[in-house]
Amino acid sequence: SERCDDWGLDTMRQIQVFEDEPARIKCPLFEHFLKFNYSTAHSAGLTLIWYWTRQDRDLEEPINFRLPENRISKEKDVLWFRPTLLNDTGNYTCMLRNTTYCSKVAFPLEVVQKDSCFNSPMKLPVHKLYIEYGIQRITCPNVDGYFPSSVKPTITWYMGCYKIQNFNNVIPEGMNLSFLIAFISNNGNYTCVVTYPENGRTFHLTRTLTVKVVGSPKNAVPPVIHSPNDHVVYEKEPGEELLIPCTVYFSFLMDSRNEVWWTIDGKKPDDIPIDVTINESISHSRTEDETRTQILSIKKVTSEDLKRSYVCHARSAKGEVAKAATVKQKVPAPRYTVELACGFGATGSGSGSHHHHHH
């Protein structure tokens, strides 16, 4: 047959559906690859053809649209399963063509099994709720188009295996689940099961999402630099290793980019002709507040390096802060001659200057 524009296997669309549930899958051509929609294509006399390759097979085969009860059907640019079976797993191709034009794309479809508590290999969307923030809602996702608006489905909400009912701060309200006030204990997987009738049959749609309770914007503050600070002096002799940690606390902020960086004499470390290494570590609190530590390290510090200005900078959506480290060259302790020591009757050695901390 004539050449066809083949967009290959669209692994970005790793579609996962539950076994024994309805699934409606739109041909990705119109969503991601072509500049026109199905209606335009149909009006122009183009035909949409579906076929598939079973899991662990190489043979492309047509989809059987003559199964009992129309288990698999096509409607416009949508491939319907009512319901799916485990062995529907495979790579599906939709091809748009007429005598002069052809374009096709394949995508993987995985039919997955769930257990009695709705655990499965399915990748779960994460919904973040602000801690102690007031009423917030999650909505049962991806159920549009399964039944007409005239059908009133039954929706049951679960946390893990357990039905949510009559609970003081989490209230099921149809397609929504309302959290009157969210606490850390509300973290977990929440599942809505949507039950609806169709042609004398009853179908179930299961949708699970992970709720993560995070820091509230009410409590958000600009970055806080814990180190360096005014209590710590980095006092070194030439030839010693200089290690200065920059430790910064960031409040959780939705979609905020947290940044930490060092400057040496007002320049980026890369722009200074000294051998500097910077190691970063990141930790998170239960509400996703972040602590970033960048340790600046100079293996063998020179007296020149000890005169430089070392400044830790931090930035988030809440603002920018900076703090300089106090770096000094250690003053050597006086070295008495034996004669002088005897003359003064000294028995101990002189001590260096005192600071709160020495690093």
């Epitope: 357990y162 204990s185 977990g188």
Partner: antibody, heavy 119, light 107 residues
Framework: QVQLVQSGAEVKKPGSSVKVSCKAS????????ISWVRQAPGQGLEWMGG????????NYAQKFQGRVTITADESTSTAYMELSSLRSEDTAVYYC????????????WGQGTLVTVSS | EIVLTQSPATLSLSPGERATLSCRAS??????LAWYQQKPGQAPRLLIY???NRATGIPARFSGSGSGTDFTLTISSLEPEDFAVYYC?????????FGQGTKVEIK
């Protein structure tokens, strides 16, 4: 570490009820669910039902529906299993066991409570 | 409900030998299966979950495999403390059910 401590052995008359308690320590009670499993003398294990500590809602095995009530008291980190209309075949060791809200395996178990039903 | 059938009912082996225990489900339970060990007068102890994941603190000589309807618990080299009754349990469907148990006894 996590501990589940159950109430002591009980001897009951047929037709009566028994209520067994299970006190949890060493973990956040509200983050878990508690299931009850029984074992008749010389027999295997039988899952009766479970409860979410945070929501207080329970799931029951059909076999025990209407005869068993599982409850949880978050304030005392204690779960309870009440079995009514007792008969001689209910003589068994009753275990409570902890699992995640969405967990299907029982990772910590109580020591068991022997309930003897005899006239 | 799903019926789990364990075989053999009794396994007579010596310390150091390999033990292979089987659990068959009446219908597919995917990999939603756990294994427990129970010693006389004690509560069961979780060994394996998700068909093949060792629980915390369980020695590496215990391993689980299988998916769908057929599962195996293997003890690579029996230690004296491994002689006990072993149960499989499925969580794919309500109610959760257990197998009738396999007793591993000293030969």
């Amino acid at each position: 570490q996590v501990q589940l401590v159950q109430s002591g052995a009980e001897v009951k008359k047929p037709g009566s009820s028994v209520k067994v308690s299970c006190k949890a320590s060493g973990g956040t009670f509200s983050s878990y669910a508690i299931s009850w499993v029984r074992q008749a003398p010389g027999q295997g294990l039988e899952w009766m039902g479970g409860i979410s500590a945070i929501f207080g809602t329970a799931n029951y095995a059909q076999k025990f529906q209407g005869r068993v009530t599982i409850t949880a008291d978050e304030s005392t980190s204690t779960a309870y299993m009440e079995l009514s209309s007792l008969r001689s075949e209910d003589t068994a060791v009753y275990y409570c066991a902890r699992h995640l809200h969405n967990g299907i395996h029982l990772d910590y178990w109580g020591q068991g409570t022997l309930v003897t039903v005899s006239s | 409900e799903i019926v789990l059938t364990q075989s053999p009912a009794t396994l007579s082996l010596s310390p150091g030998e390999r033990a292979t225990l089987s659990c068959r489900a009446s219908q597919s339970v995917s990999n939603f299966l756990a294994w427990y060990q129970q010693k006389p007068g004690q509560a069961p102890r979780l060994l394996i979950y998700g068909a093949s994941n060792r629980a915390t603190g369980i020695p590496a000589r215990f391993s689980g495999s299988g998916s769908g309807t057929d599962f195996t618990l293997t003890i690579s080299s029996l230690e004296p403390e491994d002689f006990a009754v072993y149960y499989c349990q499925q969580g794919k469907h309500w109610p959760w059910t257990f197998g009738q148990g396999t007793k591993v006894e000293i030969k």
